[in-house]
């Protein structure tokens, strides 16, 4: 009877606090009045005074909101004295799993990301690699799931679709022939990365492509 | 560090309008309730009313609902208490802070109101 | 709504010694709700117990808070010099979260 199943809290919660969470119960409560409390970071423990507990009732209280990228598991103790203060359980772990909520936006490790190619190349020669990184849960959501597009291309010659980005690795790839340094030395992509696979909040970043010189041209006397 | 600045004192003529902040840093702005306090001269505090900036639920005092007007602006980070129409009993230092049980304090805003 | 009285008004001690100030609320708050604070002279009031007897951060261990029900005591084993200002309850189990009127500590 003296056992709590792990106990999951989103992150974020709006309150009011203190929230009250689950109730630690003693059967020993039918013989003697029990008073209870509880230990550890969270606790009595840095971060202190996250949670408490009603030491007549048991019940566990939240006091205030909690941050899943700050500390994603609590795990406490709880225990159970008479009003002798003699222990009558042995002391009781208590799993608090903090739940995900999608309230960062992903970053790109850079403001400006700087690559070089061939002119000439064939289609699908990878560029580049961009990476944006995302603080939420990318394993149990996809709140931190991040996806890449390309957002625009400057200038748009000979077309506006000369490269592409795979959406989940970041790399930038060749897509269409042409490339020309006579022509275009230097394109700027904008590039954007969204969480939630692509469907939640953006951030963009700069991916500029150097076209490099191939010994293309035949001199000229 | 969690912090809470206020805007600065403020004096104004009985009739006018006004509007004061509070702007939250060191913290997600948006997970906390934002109280005001209203403490007159020489005087106790008062709970004038609580807003949860994410998505601005308000919940003012009855002795306080209708006189004043609670907003939050969760791009900026700040928490505002406004008046239409300055009262001389409106002269008090107000306090922002944060939490059902306020465990951090602006450093209040001096409000006087006098023809 | 609930109506916090606290007692004495002015409490007029020596440092070294014991502070005692009561709060009696109008009808019962569950003990997870009572705070008590700290206000100095032109300064914002300061969290000192939350929970009626949890310490908040950076409190030193003579204060100290307790109570259920009704009745609720902070307690402040030896008076510090800087202990001498106005306290002030608050309940925050239903709104409005009304504050008692404050007790002065001052120096004898």
């Known amino acids: 009877d003296w056992v709590v199943a792990p106990i999951s809290v989103p992150e974020n919660g709006k309150g009011p606090f203190p929230q009250r969470l689950n109730q630690l119960k003693s059967n020993k409560d039918r013989d003697t009045k029990i008073f209870y409390s509880i230990t550890g970071p969270g606790a009595d423990s840095p971060p202190e005074g996250v949670f408490a507990v009603e030491k007549e009732t048991g019940w566990l209280l939240l006091n205030k909101p909690l941050d899943r990228e700050e500390i994603a598991k609590y795990e406490l103790f709880g225990h159970a004295v008479s009003e002798n203060g003699a222990s009558v359980e042995d002391p009781m772990n208590i799993s608090i799993i903090v739940t995900d909520q999608n309230d960062h936006k992903p970053k790109f490790t850079q403001d400006t990301f700087r690559g070089s190619v061939l002119e000439g190349v064939l289609p699908g020669t990878s560029v580049m690699q961009v990476t944006a990184t995302d603080e939420d849960d990318a394993i149990y959501t996809y709140n931190g799931v991040v996806a890449y597009s390309i957002h625009s291309q400057e200038p748009k010659d000979p077309h506006d679709l000369m490269f592409t980005i795979h959406r989940s690795t970041g790399t930038i790839s060749v897509i269409s022939s042409g490339l020309d340094r006579e022509k275009v030395p230097e394109y700027t992509l904008t590039i954007q990365a969204t969480d939630m696979d692509g469907d939640g909040s953006t951030t963009t970043a700069v991916a500029v492509v150097e076209i490099l010189d191939a010994n293309d041209n035949a001199p000229m006397f | 560090e969690v912090q809470l600045v206020q805007s600065g004192a403020e004096v104004k003529k009985p009739g006018e309008s006004l509007k004061i902040s509070c702007k939250g840093s060191?913290?997600?702005?948006?997970?906390?309730?934002i109280g005001w306090v209203r403490q007159m001269p020489g005087k106790g505090l008062e709970w004038m009313g609580i807003?949860?900036?994410?998505?601005?639920?308000?919940r003012y005092s009855p002795s306080f609902q209708g006189q004043v007007t609670i907003s939050a602006d969760k791009s900026i980070s700040t928490a505002y208490l406004q008046w239409s129409s300055l009262k001389a009993s409106d002269t008090a230092m107000y306090y922002c802070?944060?939490?059902?049980?306020?465990?951090?304090w602006g450093q209040g805003t001096l409000v006087t109101v006098s023809s | 709504e609930i109506v916090l009285t606290q007692s004495p008004g002015t409490l007029s001690l020596s440092p070294g010694e014991r502070a005692t100030l009561s709060c009696r609320a109008s009808?019962?708050?569950?003990?997870?709700?009572l705070a008590w604070y700290q206000q100095k002279p032109g300064q914002a009031p300061r969290l000192l117990i939350y929970?009626?007897?949890s310490r908040a951060t950076g409190i030193p261990d003579r204060f100290s808070g307790s109570g259920s029900g009704t009745d609720f005591t902070l307690t402040i084993s030896r008076l510090e010099p800087e202990d001498f200002a106005v306290y002030y309850c608050?309940?925050?189990?239903?709104?409005?979260?009304?504050f008692g009127q404050g007790t002065k500590v001052e120096i004898k």
């Open positions: 802070a944060r939490h059902s049980f306020f465990d951090y």
């Open positions: 060191g913290y997600s702005f948006t997970s906390y309730w």
């Open positions: 807003i949860y900036p994410g998505d601005s639920d308000t």
């Open positions: 009808q019962s708050v569950s003990s997870i709700y």
């Open positions: 929970g009626a007897s």
């Open positions: 608050q309940q925050y189990s239903s709104s409005p979260r009304t």
